[in-house]
Amino acid sequence: KAMHVAQPAVVLASSRGIASFVCEYASPGKATEVRVTVLRQADSQVTEVCAATYMMGNELTFLDDSICTGTSSGNQVNLTIQGLRAMDTGLYICKVELMYPPPYYLGIGNGTQIYVIDPEPCPDSD
């Protein structure tokens, strides 16, 4: 059975520009090293938002300057993207790669449409 990656269809970012979603994969093998990448698709252009490699049983670690954080539990990854603004609205795709041991396997989710609404500025109070 091929590797399947599931993620929610739609997520609404919080007023603070934070969006969280779960990326879950059905693994065809017993991977010990997994790479998770978040891709953003907008206007048919695909760009990498963030990526992290983790050892099964260990924590997911993104680079210090990454806008992503996450935790892992078995074949499930909880992803959080912060610092989002209205212009960042788009389809966020979860890509999972089983890196080790060989063989390598690839799985790509259908994407989560993240809607970001910039907060209205507070009116001045007298």
């Epitope: 590797m3 891709l39 760009t47 795709i93 080790y100 063989p103 799985g107 790509i108």
Partner: antibody, heavy 111, light 103 residues
Framework: GVVQPGRSLRLSCAAS????????MHWVRQAPGKGLEWVAV????????YYADSVKGRFTISRDNSKNTLYLQMNSLRAEDTAVYYC?????????????WGQGTTVTVSS | TQSPSSLSASVGDRVTITCRAS??????LNWYQQKPGKAPKFLIY???ILQSGVPSGFSASGSGPDFTLTISSLQPEDFATYYC?????????FGPGTKVDIK
């Protein structure tokens, strides 16, 4: 180049026009009059390498990101390794989809 | 496997090439075009997504194990050999190719 069976050869592929250190890179070969055969891939940072069974243990893929160069060290060469060897860039979304290809270099293994 | 291994067609013809995977590779199939003496050109990835710059006359579909590449109206520059390739798992194997030549 022409090389005798059992000997070694190193291929180089100098990349330009893109951020080399951000992409996985592949070697693909094509024997005369035959189809394409995937040979090896190396991840953007050199952390992972995978090989076709036909070259495993004989060929080594490597890269030098400071020189924007991909290498293929070929040892214990055989007549069946005679082919045009292409380097190719892995795509962002699908690392094994090769979206940019080099012009190819011919390797002939013959005594 | 790819079928047919070769076909003869005329300019304006609709051409369909089939690729069958020997294992479940989900949607992870790519298509390439190669002309004699030239490097392959990347056409399609993840079964149906056209690479930017590829003419809209090319389309593809499928999900393991059967995939198809269609050229809606064959142009003179489309006479070439077409290869499918799976990108789901190592080794990243290519199909044997389909040669499209002039009738």
């Amino acid at each position: 180049g022409v090389v005798q069976p059992g000997r070694s050869l190193r291929l180089s592929c100098a990349a330009s026009g893109f951020t080399f250190s951000s992409y996985g890179m592949h070697w693909v070969r094509q024997a005369p009059g035959k189809g394409l055969e995937w040979v090896a891939v190396i991840w953007y940072d050199g952390s992972h390498k995978y090989y076709a069974d036909s070259v495993k243990g004989r060929f080594t893929i490597s890269r030098d990101n400071s020189k924007n160069t991909l290498y293929l060290q070929m040892n214990s060469l055989r007549a069946e390794d005679t082919a045009v060897y292409y380097c190719a860039r892995g795509a962002v979304v699908v690392p094994a989809a090769m979206d940019v290809w080099g012009q190819g270099t011919t390797v002939t293994v013959s005594s | 496997t790819q079928s047919p291994s070769s076909l003869s067609a005329s300019v304006g013809d609709r051409v369909t090439i089939t690729c069958r995977a020997s294992q479940n590779i989900s949607r992870y199939l790519n298509w390439y075009q190669q002309k004699p003496g030239k490097a392959p050109k990347f056409l399609i990835y993840v079964a149906s997504i056209l690479q930017s710059g590829v003419p809209s006359g090319f389309s593809a579909s499928g999900s393991g194990p059967d995939f198809t590449l269609t050229i809606s109206s064959l142009q003179p520059e489309d006479f070439a050999t077409y290869y499918c390739q799976q990108s789901y798992s190592t080794p990243f194997t290519f199909g044997p190719g389909t040669k499209v030549d002039i009738k």
